[in-house]
């Protein structure tokens, strides 16, 4: 499996293809948004993962989870199973 890969970037063009480990079964895309922003400021995170549930449980730092749980940040996690399927903008 190949997936787009980038960490906490505000520019999707910074993502690059990466060959996953044999244990990885999905490509994940995580979008972190400030819902109060009129510009809908956001960052994107793309990666290989063993499962979508793993991403939801392990990607976010304690620091970010504080903002997510309080509603300051909003998170969307999408997963797919085909090569580079997480390459769409955002």
């Amino acid at each position: 499996l190949w997936c787009q890969d980038c960490t906490l970037t505000t520019n999707s063009s910074h993502c690059t293809p990466k060959q996953c480990q044999p244990s990885d079964t999905v490509c994940a895309s995580v979008r972190i948004t400030d819902p109060s922003s009129s510009r809908k400021d956001h960052s994107v995170n793309k990666m290989c993962a063993s499962s979508c549930d793993f991403v939801k449980r392990h990607f976010f730092s304690d620091y970010l989870m504080g903002f997510i749980n309080s509603g300051i940040l909003k998170v969307d996690v999408d997963c797919c199973e085909k090569d580079l399927c997480n390459g769409a903008a955002g």
Epitope: T7, L8, T9, T10, I32, D34, S36, S37, R39, D41, H42, S43, H58, F59, S61, D62, Y63, L64, G66, F67, S70, I72, L73
Partner: antibody, heavy 120, light 107 residues
Framework: QVQLQESGPGLVKPSGTLSLTCAVS?????????WSWVRQPPGKGLEWIGE???????NYNPSLKSRVTISVDKSKNQFSLKLSSVTAADTAVYYC?????????????WGQGTLVTVSS | DIQMTQSPSSLSASVGDRVTITCRAS??????LNWYQQKPGKAPKLLIY???SLQSGVPSRFSGSGSGTDFTLTISSLQPEDFATYYC?????????FGQGTRLEIK
């Protein structure tokens, strides 16, 4: 280009209260960022004091929490630091900085810093 | 609190050298690691965020790598303006903490 500028007294007496303000220009304090204070004693490393969001939500370093208050004034596009019961150990360069939480929590813009000396 | 330990504490090198500074966290911080450069009398400047992302405007000779507990900052070919003190910083949990710094000096 976001710019930050610290201001406040450079000398504070022991047991007194240190008060500093950070003026933000070139951007809104109500943006998708938190706003932080970091200090650096002479010749030493960096220590995070705490941070504030435009809503007034705060996070503080537990080692200083009992003495620290950070507040925000959206109408003036600025935020402030108060540190009470100061001692010589609080002598440091105090920096204000913008925190980019969308990219995980880094300090992407800094003020130039202001030296505060605690002495009688 | 998460302790951040940098090595070496100081380093002498020459213009053109390849230099690597390491930072170790006392527990896993995933990729929530940032690097700063500080020159005397100046504020720190963000170089690398999220372990490996180059901050806008920072020369490409700077690069970062690592995840979990071990991280590196590499300067591929030292320039005269690179002699400074470098700090790592974790943003995995509060309190946010910094390494003690690595002073890079001219040999």
């Amino acid at each position: 280009q976001v710019q930050l500028q610290e201001s406040g007294p450079g000398l504070v007496k022991p047991s007194g209260t240190l008060s500093l303000t950070c003026a933000v220009s070139g951007g809104s304090i109500s943006s998708s960022n938190w706003w932080s204070w970091v200090r650096q004693p002479p010749g030493k490393g960096l220590e995070w004091i705490g941070e504030i969001y435009h809503s007034g939500s705060t996070n503080y370093n537990p080692s200083l929490k009992s003495r620290v208050t950070i507040s925000v004034d959206k109408s003036k596009n600025q935020f402030s630091l108060k540190l009470s019961s100061v001692t010589a150990a609080d002598t440091a360069v105090y920096y204000c900085a913008r925190v980019d939480i969308l990219t995980g929590g880094n300090f992407d813009y800094w003020g130039q810093g202001t030296l505060v000396t605690v002495s009688s | 609190d998460i302790q951040m330990t940098q090595s070496p504490s100081s380093l002498s090198a020459s213009v053109g050298d390849r230099v690597t500074i390491t930072c170790r966290a006392s527990q896993s911080i995933s990729s929530y690691l940032n690097w700063y450069q500080q020159k005397p009398g100046k504020a720190p400047k963000l170089l690398i965020y999220a372990a490996s992302s180059l901050q806008s405007g920072v020369p490409s000779r700077f690069s970062g790598s690592g995840s979990g507990t071990d991280f590196t900052l590499t300067i591929s070919s030292l320039q005269p303006e690179d002699f400074a003190t470098y700090y790592c910083q974790q943003s995995y949990s509060t309190p946010i903490t910094f390494g003690q710094g690595t002073r890079l000096e001219i040999k």
